[in-house]
């Protein structure tokens, strides 16, 4: 609350998080033509990513382009893509929505089909949907332990979010332990009135503000965080846009001498931890 | 405009960012002591890294060091690293210019140098120019598109800087299109009057600012994005004080049951996305 | 100091940072049975990553699991996860602390433990200490030249802590150079009263406080930066919290057409570059 | 262009031994061998670094074939016992900057083991 005779300050942060948990997943796998169901783990090491403080990343779901190759190939027959001559294939044409640059000739995609040939990685990308459900849709278990020390510089005094009388296995609930700094990532959803298992197919962006309303004066000392949850990215958004929340890397490799990659479409929250609030004192 | 009848608040801000392009790179390819031209494709999982949102950085060049290995080898004769005898050469010495430990032998490094011998990643990495012009100056043409979310906890007030009566195809211009969050990135360098061609041989930061002037009060609302733009890193800056934007990263692989990686100085932009300002309100 | 009179504004920043050193790394590595010292080089793309520009690694000890697959196999006998028969093991349970999915199954580890058979990256991760001393102990001589560039948009006024003037060869001291930018790590341990071969083992977080206080009034002009160090993590830190830092990654690759990995648990610094202040002007 | 020539191949009987020479035009960091068999790859052999140090050998080799430097010389030899017939190829002389890179190779020497 505000307190007019007092000096305010600006709170300056840092902050540190730890993600758990282990998602079994279960998808198609095709090896020489053969298509069969594959059971594998993912660890932290597979799902997450070493990111700053402020941010962290949880794999919800994938789309894998394996074994592409820098060369010559039909790019993919998305809407309005097709073509039945070489007429509509420019020489050197990069379409934003292709994912290479157009050698000027129309080329069979498929039985049906022709698109334009493009020099890229090979075969290029198809624009398939995420896997609905998610593959990695059991993250909603995992969870996150927040670590968040403050400083008031022009005060002189420095706090954490953990205190040693805090017990390392309890889980934050809003009414039951709101000072608990370990939160189950469907918690975190649930309480922003948010549906994980949807979430988790596009990706999101979660945001899991943290709010310091610090009186330093000795006779009325307080100086705890709040914590509250909210969806940052717009779940409304056009497709134009990008809705969700997906980013793409790539695994590079040799294969008899050819540079190969395995290229990944990982959808996924991530999670950006908003610190903020006041210091005052007399 | 300052208007002093009213609680202001800083803002709290996400930021999410989407880059897209492909770029066509020639350089000049040595296998098996015959140079040829090589043609690749960059797109986004090869130019750019998953990165936080409030930075993303753009691959514009790169000096590749193929096939290293731990072993001993001749270090690279930059100024002042030549030797004639092992009384040059100290044993255990780490030069912080050099990028091995000296062994305390003089050893020679071609046909008329020699240069103290290190323990290192071999060949040592040679302290060539980045190539002019630089080998993705293409991506001028590449385009981001940034997602702002921000909140003024204290007046309970979100929005964001995607309108939904916006347009996905659109492209930012300072008069034409200044709500537009599409930013070709050979625009933000014009803005900046800055050149891009220049900056990416040796790579740059550039700062896009939002500032958000926003009057929360119902009969004179208005909370919509200012987008500017100015160059972060100092283009005048002393050979000592590393100009320009790089780093390294290696690809690490077995040969033959060896250890060896290829290591990729990348010089490149890194966009910092600043956002700023206060919400106000009677 | 306050002056009532001035119109005051928060900084807006951004940080580049570059870090330089070598290390030698002595361990036993163990091939085809035979244990032996292996002498390593980790320059800086093999101890430090691409982060963002408020935040730098430094990667300081390491755990290596090497050719992890994914199969079934008996998890570690930590304290408390010994079984005598199948019915402590309960198929399809994930134990947080553990690595993988349970079968349901009681199988030796090893000549005189049993444990839970799991599904995950096999065999699993070893829980033993980090190595004491460190590994990278000698990043204690690393130097990281720090850029700062900031703004006051409200006054227009920008500025960065490297002026023209200065050397590149300095090394920032307290009293003696307290504008040089070049940081050598363990005097920043020192200036924050901490042990670096200490904090090295289990990893930690270090705060590098760039404080602007401006006066920008052109008779009384005065606007540069002040340096200081304060540990962020908390050392004191209960077990349950997980002390230090660390975090997991794994490099991935193919072996007889099996996908394997390396898991690396890496310890070290990270070191978050926390700018504040502000500026007045009449 | 480096002019590496090599010297000492010839017709031997399993179990025997030969010595291959070569002879480098300027001085050069580190000196190896290779071989190609017929219907292989090129594989490593030997390799020295400046004055023998470091040494590295392939494991097929290792126990039987052993290189020496002269530096003085800008030579290279490697002595091979115990011979067997998977060691028939034709050998080159190779100069790089390190054990683990070579740059030259010379025109080659066959050595073919007789069982």
């Known amino acids: 609350s505000d307190k007019l005779y007092q000096r305010k300050e600006p709170v300056i942060s840092s902050v540190h998080t730890k993600v758990k948990g282990i998602a079994e997943v279960t998808e198609n796998v095709t090896e020489g033509g053969v298509t069969k169901l594959g059971h594998s783990i993912f660890d932290t090491a597979d799902y997450t990513f070493p990111l700053q403080g402020n941010s962290f990343f949880v794999m919800t779901n994938y789309v894998k382009s394996e074994g592409q190759v820098q060369t010559l190939c039909p790019e993919y027959p998305r809407r309005g893509a097709q073509c039945s001559s070489d007429r509509r294939c420019k020489k050197g044409w990069m379409d934003p929505q292709s994912k290479g640059i157009q050698t000027g000739r129309c080329v069979p995609y498929d039985k049906t089909r022709k698109t334009c040939e493009v020099s890229a990685w090979c075969p290029t990308e198809e624009e398939k949907e995420a896997p609905r459900p998610a593959l990695l849709r059991s993250a909603e278990n995992f969870t996150v332990l927040i670590k968040n020390n403050i400083h008031f510089p022009g005060h002189n005094y420095t706090t954490r979010n953990i205190l040693p009388t805090m017990n390392g296995s309890c889980t934050f609930h809003k009414t039951w332990d709101p000072q608990c700094s370990i939160f189950r990532l469907g918690d975190i959803f649930q309480e922003a009135g948010e549906n994980f298992t949807e979430v988790a197919v596009q990706g999101g962006i979660m945001g899991i503000e943290i709010y310091w309303d610090c009186n330093l004066d000795s006779w009325s000392h307080h100086c705890r965080p709040r914590y509250s949850f909210r969806r940052l990215d717009d779940k409304n958004m056009d497709e134009s846009f990008v809705p969700g929340y997906n980013f793409r890397y790539a695994k590079y490799y040799k294969e008899n001498n050819v540079e190969k990659r395995t290229l990944i479409k990982a959808f996924g929250i991530r999670f950006d931890i908003l610190v903020f609030g006041t210091g005052g004192k007399f | 405009s300052d208007k002093l009848y009213q609680r202001k608040e800083p803002v709290i801000s996400s930021v999410h960012t989407k880059v897209k392009g492909i770029a066509e790179v020639t350089e000049n390819v040595t296998e098996g002591g015959v140079t040829k031209l090589g043609h690749s494709i960059f797109d986004t999982a090869d130019y750019t890294f998953p990165l936080q949102g409030n930075s993303f950085f753009v691959m514009t060049n790169y000096v590749k060091s193929e096939g290293q290995v731990q072993t001993l080898c001749p270090e690279y004769p930059r100024r002042g690293a030549q030797c004639s005898s092992d009384r040059r050469c100290k044993k255990g010495w780490m030069d912080p210019q050099s990028k091995g430990i000296q062994t305390g032998r003089c050893v020679p490094y071609d046909k008329t140098r020699k240069t103290c011998e290190v323990s290192a990643w071999c060949p040592t990495e040679e302290e060539k120019e980045a190539p002019r012009p630089a080998l993705l100056r293409s991506a001028e043409n590449f385009t981001v598109l940034i997602k702002n979310n921000i909140h003024f906890p204290g007046h309970n007030y979100t929005t964001r800087n995607i309108l939904p009566t916006m347009n996905g195809s659109c492209t930012f211009h300072k008069t034409w299109d200044p709500q537009c969050s599409i930013f070709r990135l050979g625009d933000i360098f014009q803005e900046a009057g800055e050149n891009f061609t220049e900056v990416a041989v040796q790579g740059g930061i550039m700062g896009i600012e939002i500032y958000w002037d926003c009057n929360l009060d119902s009969w004179s609302h208005h909370c919509r994005p200012r987008y500017s733009f100015r160059r972060l890193d100092d283009k005048n800056m002393d050979e000592s004080f590393v100009p320009g934007y790089n780093f390294r990263y290696a690809k690490y692989y077995k040969e033959n049951n060896v250890e060896k990686r290829t290591l990729i100085k990348a010089f490149g932009i890194r966009f910092d996305i600043l956002v700023f300002g206060t919400g106000g309100k009677f | 100091s306050d002056k009532l009179y001035q119109r005051k504004e928060p900084v807006i920043s951004s940080v580049h940072t570059k870090v330089k050193g070598i290390a030698e790394v002595t361990e036993n590595v163990t091939e085809g049975g035979v244990t032996k010292l292996g002498h390593s080089i980790f320059d800086t793309a093999d101890y430090t990553f691409p982060l963002q520009g408020n935040s730098f690694f430094v990667m300081t000890n390491y755990v290596k699991s090497e050719g992890q697959v994914q199969t079934l196999c008996p998890e570690y006998p930590r304290r408390g996860a010994q079984c005598s028969s199948d019915r402590r093991c309960k198929k399809g349970w994930m134990d947080p602390q553990s690595k993988g999915i349970q079968t349901g199954r009681c199988v030796p580890y090893d000549k005189t433990r049993k444990t839970c058979e799991v599904s995950a990256w096999c065999p699993t991760e070893e829980e033993k200490e980090a190595p004491r001393p460190a590994l990278l102990r000698s990043a204690e001589n690393f130097t990281v030249l720090i850029k700062n560039n900031i703004h006051f948009p409200g006054h227009n006024y920008t500025t960065r802590n490297i002026l023209p003037t200065m050397n590149g060869s300095c090394t920032f001291h307290k009293t003696w150079d307290p504008q040089c930018s070049i940081f050598r790590l363990g005097d920043i341990f020192q200036e924050a009263g901490e042990n670096f071969t200490e904090v090295a083992v289990q990893g930690g977080i270090m705060g590098i406080e760039i404080y602007w206080d401006c006066n920008l009034d052109s008779w009384s002009h005065h606007c540069r930066p002040r340096y200081s160090f304060r540990r962020l993590d908390d050392k004191n830190m209960d077990e349950s919290f997980v002390p230090g830092y660390n975090f997991r990654y794994a490099k991935y690759y193919k072996e007889n057409n099996v996908e394997k990995r390396t898991l690396i648990k890496a310890f070290g610094i990270r070191f978050d570059i926390l700018v504040f202040g502000t500026g007045g002007k009449f | 262009e480096v002019q590496l020539v090599e010297s000492g191949g010839g017709l031997v009987q399993a179990g025997g031994s030969l010595r291959l020479s070569c002879a480098a035009p300027?001085?050069?960091?580190?000196m190896g061998w290779f071989r190609q068999a017929p219907g292989k790859e090129r594989e490593f052999v030997a390799g020295?670094?400046?004055?023998?140090?470091?040494?590295r050998y392939a494991d097929s080799v290792k126990g039987r074939f052993t290189i020496s430097r002269d530096n003085a010389k800008n030579t290279v030899s490697l002595q091979m016992s115990g011979l067997k017939p998977e060691d028939t190829a034709i050998y080159y002389c190779?100069?790089?900057?390190?054990?683990?890179?070579?740059?030259?190779w010379g025109q080659g020497t066959q050595v073919t083991v007789s069982s």
């Open positions: 020295s670094g400046w004055d023998g140090i470091p040494t």
């Open positions: 190779a100069t790089g900057t390190s054990v683990y890179h070579y740059q030259y």
């Open positions: 300027e001085r050069t960091y580190s």
